[in-house]
Interface confidence: medium
């Protein structure tokens, strides 16, 4: 039997190499420096030379979305924004509408709004109190459905209260990938006053509780909300069956009109060779066994 993959936040999100130390503008993190950031390739002279001249009339120039190096017009307050759109201007953050049931999706779709960053940080302080005491937890909502705060959160209503993952603990996560014989092992360091290290093996004790896809999905949703920046390629949340195993067909998110490519996997999420599409045509996985 093939081994289950490590959880997505450690595996598929390894493209989000999270930096240690204070964020820099190139990384596009919040000025507070609390959140993890994406490492982009440096904007060297060669990269800059490929840029077209910036637009002539702009209230403010900002870098292109994602890891782009060229300059473009910033979005102003109240304008729609998202992960793939132009950036909001200085002092503004892209935030989903308060009633979004899928804040992350809204930002991927460009349905966020550029809002005042100071208002957002005040909201963040308000929305993120100390974790409730274990055993008997209750929180007054008071517009906790105000969705994600400044980032592609899954929504403040969907956050875990485990102190280890609490944003106020200002911990920066570093993902290190290594190999251990036939299974991949991901070491995750939570760096704070006391360093706390956990090893996530590809075979988890929770294997009996949920299938690997279900665990991957939950871990992804629980961890995405603490990322201040997402990969410009978007984030893949796996397609699971009701037993928590991988459905045969997995797809990357679409970007605008461009369909994300799809591929076929077995029940443990291992890609099956020869079944992929780059969006030109649909991939058919139905003839294969994934159960």
């Amino acid at each position: 039997m093939q081994r289950a993959r490590p959880t997505l936040w450690a595996a598929a999100l390894t493209l989000l190499v999270l930096l240690r130390g204070p964020p820099v503008a190139r990384a596009g993190a919040s000025s507070a420096g609390l959140g993890p950031v994406v490492r982009c390739e440096p904007c060297d002279a060669r990269a800059l030379a490929q840029c077209a001249p910036p637009p002539a009339v702009c209230a403010e120039l900002v870098r292109e979305p994602g890891c782009g190096c060229c300059l473009t017009c910033a979005l102003s307050e109240g304008q729609p924004c998202g992960i793939y759109t132009e950036r909001c201007g200085s002092g503004l953050r892209c935030q989903p509408s308060p009633d979004e049931a899928r804040p992350l999706q809204a930002l991927l779709d460009g349905r966020g709004l550029c809002v005042n960053a100071s208002a957002v940080s005040r909201l963040r302080a308000y929305l993120l109190p100390a974790p409730p005491a274990p055993g008997n937890a209750s929180e007054s909502e008071e517009d906790r459905s105000a969705g994600s705060v400044e980032s592609p959160s899954v929504s403040s209503t969907h956050r875990v209260s485990d102190p280890k993952f609490h944003p106020l603990h200002s911990k920066i996560i570093i993902i290190k990938k290594g190999h251990a014989k036939d299974s991949q092992r991901y070491k995750v360091d939570y760096e704070s006053q006391s360093t706390d290290t956990q090893n996530f093996s590809s075979e988890s004790k929770r294997e009996t509780e949920y299938g690997p896809c279900r665990r991957e999905m939950e871990d992804t949703l629980n961890h995405l909300k603490f990322l201040n920046v997402l990969s410009p390629r978007g984030v893949h949340i796996p397609n699971c069956d009701k037993k928590g195993f991988y459905k045969k067909k997995q797809c990357r998110p679409s970007k605008g009109r461009k369909r994300g490519f799809c591929w076929c996997v077995d029940k443990y999420g291992q890609p099956l060779p020869g079944y992929t599409t780059k969006g030109k045509e649909d991939v058919h996985c139905y003839s294969m066994q994934s159960k």
């Epitope: 009633d99 979004e100 049931a101 899928r102 992350l104 999706q105 991927l108 974790p131 409730p132 937890a137 209750s138 929180e139 007054s140 909502e141 906790r144 459905s145 403040s156 209503t157 969907h158 956050r159 875990v160 209260s161 485990d162 896809c213 999905m217 939950e218 949703l221 984030v235 949340i237 796996p238 397609n239 699971c240 009701k242 797809c251 998110p253 679409s254």
Partner: antibody, heavy 125, light 107 residues
């Protein structure tokens, strides 16, 4: 197999607080969302709100000022409190597991896939 | 809040008939819609999620379709045990909202 059981008084006086508890058996309350839904006699369903096992909540704005949902993970229970009740709050109250499944084109969908059998609450003096 | 309007409010059909129930959202909800079946005196039961995905254990005669604002639940061959009230539920925005229900009776 996960089962849900609502419990609480079947009769509440106007202006008092309605209190119901949902006990989860056959599985852990952890890692799921848990919801309350109600159905007035002969009418449709109304979503009241949900709670995550960590304690995070989301309420229906139409009831928000009067609703509190809490969770007790040690007892595998979650509870509903509805204050200042009137006859309009007379209904069958259901608790349900509010789960996430993935799909396309959205990244995830919410489903209420396990329900309690419901408990009737009458508001009357 | 997003309003969900179901039609018809009730219908009567014979065993073996093809039955169609529609649900209209007051604004676009993509395919963030589920269908639930409720029999008298019992809790609702999930049939369809994500507009067209069949919940595990639900008979294949039930199917869902639609996207945006207009959705359909179809029972391809009505069975006696399908006599119930059917509700749609949008999970695109909070608050989650149900349709008013469609009561299906067997002739």
């Amino acid at each position: 197999q996960v089962q849900l059981q609502e419990s609480g008084p079947g009769l509440v006086k106007p202006s008092e607080t309605l209190s119901l508890t949902c006990t989860v058996s056959g599985g852990s309350i952890s890692t799921y969302y848990w919801s309350w839904i109600r159905q007035p006699p002969g009418k449709g369903l109304e979503w009241i709100g949900y709670i995550y096992y960590s304690g995070s909540t989301n309420y229906n704005p139409s009831l928000k000022s009067r609703v509190t949902i809490s969770v007790d993970t040690s007892k595998n229970q979650f509870s509903l409190k509805l204050s200042s009740v009137t006859a309009a709050d007379t209904a069958v109250y259901y608790c349900a597991r509010y789960d996430i499944v993935t799909g396309y084109p959205h990244y995830y969908y919410y489903v209420m896939d396990v329900w309690g059998q419901g408990t009737t609450v009458t508001v009357s003096s | 809040a997003i309003q969900m309007t179901q039609s018809p409010s009730s219908l009567s059909a014979s065993v073996g008939d093809r039955v169609t129930i529609t649900c209209r959202a007051s604004r676009g909800i993509r395919n963030a819609l589920g269908w639930y079946q409720q029999k008298p005196g019992t809790a609702p039961k999930l049939l369809i999620y994500a507009a067209s995905s069949l919940q595990s254990g639900v008979p294949s005669r039930f199917s869902g379709s639609g996207s945006g604002t207009d959705f359909t639940l179809t029972i391809s061959s009505l069975q006696p045990e399908d006599s119930a009230t059917y509700y749609c539920l949008q999970d695109y925005n909070y608050p989650l909202t149900f349709g008013g229900g469609t009561k299906v009776e067997i002739k």
